[in-house]
């Protein structure tokens, strides 16, 4: 099942500062940066048949909450 984007907020750490759209939370520096500065997957153009460039990640068929493709690229961190 496809899930909506989820944030990096969770029970195991304080919630990161919410990022504005087009920004992503970088765990290594622990603040928001332009998503373009991170290797965020780019969506395929409509009708594209090849895998999206810049990523070798894909979701498992039965992904648990917050683990799959829908988690990328986490802009906004609502």
């Amino acid at each position: 099942m496809r899930r909506g984007p989820r944030s990096l907020r969770g029970r195991d750490a304080p919630a990161p500062t919410p990022c504005v759209p087009a920004e992503c939370f970088d765990l290594l520096v622990r603040h928001c940066v332009a998503c373009g500065l991170l290797r965020t997957p780019r969506p395929k153009p409509a009708g594209a048949s090849s895998p999206a460039p810049r990523t070798a990640l894909q979701p498992q068929e039965s992904v648990g909450a917050g683990a799959g493709e829908a988690a990328l690229p986490l802009p906004g961190l609502l």
């Epitope: 907020r9 969770g10 992503c24 373009g36 991170l38 990640l57 917050g66 683990a67």
Partner: antibody
């Protein structure tokens, strides 16, 4: 498709500085994190450090005093220097890059064996 | 540093059998609701290959017989039915915090 290729001398003398370069194609090193990892013969993997999109660096504390990672954005390359090497630094050296947001190293170079010997 | 301990060190199995590999972390690798645990396969003379990221997600091109599970400190990589090409060394790796660390590896060998 992102490709990484390590290059540099395969033989370094003790007490000298090991220098390796990773050439990246298919992506810009001004985005993401660019890492060095090594593997001693027949052993496990050891993380060395990274240089980031901004040029900031992180070095594993176990090697920090001897390591320098730098980059040349015009050539889309990043480099590793390890000083005062000994035989214990003989290893296969890999460059690798993780994706976001899971920081899983999905792209690797093929590795280059560096032997420290006189 | 987060220490990862893999068991067993060696697993001797036959093609078609199920392989269960374990990785235990010295502290939780969960953060922001994500388990930052990854699994790699390495064959002699080759670079490690990402199999599983974020504990349970297969990387591109990885067959469905590979699956990952776990959270917190205890993680498992399962190969449901071993193929001849699956005999290799498997490493877990945490990407919760630097220095990123690897387990010592589990060698899956032909019985």
């Amino acid at each position: 498709q992102v490709q990484l290729q390590e290059s540099g001398p395969g033989l370094v003398k003790p007490s000298q500085t090991l220098s390796l370069t990773c050439t990246v194609s298919g992506d810009s090193i001004t985005s993401g994190y660019w890492n060095w990892i090594r593997q001693h013969p027949g052993k496990g993997l050891e993380y060395i450090g990274y240089i980031s999109y901004s040029g900031s660096t992180y070095y594993n504390p176990s090697l920090k005093s001897r390591v320098t990672i730098s980059r040349d954005t015009s050539k889309n390359q990043f480099s590793l220097k390890l000083s005062s090497v000994t035989a214990a630094d003989t290893a296969v050296y890999y460059c690798a890059s993780p994706n976001y947001p899971f920081y899983a190293m999905d792209y690797w170079g093929q590795g280059t064996l560096v032997t420290v010997s006189s | 540093d987060i220490v990862l301990t893999q068991s067993p060190a060696t697993l001797s199995l036959s093609p078609g059998e199920r392989a269960t590999l374990s990785c235990r972390a010295s502290e939780s690798v969960d953060n922001y609701g994500i388990s930052f645990m990854n699994w790699f396969q390495q064959k002699p003379g080759q670079a490690p290959r990402l199999l599983i990221y974020a504990a349970s997600n297969r990387a591109t091109g990885i067959p469905a017989r590979f699956s990952g599970s776990g959270s917190g400190t205890d993680f498992t990589l399962t190969i449901s039915s071993l193929e001849p090409e699956d005999f290799a060394v498997y490493y877990c790796q945490q990407s919760k915090e630097v220095p990123w660390t690897f387990g010592g590896g589990t060698k899956v060998e032909i019985k």
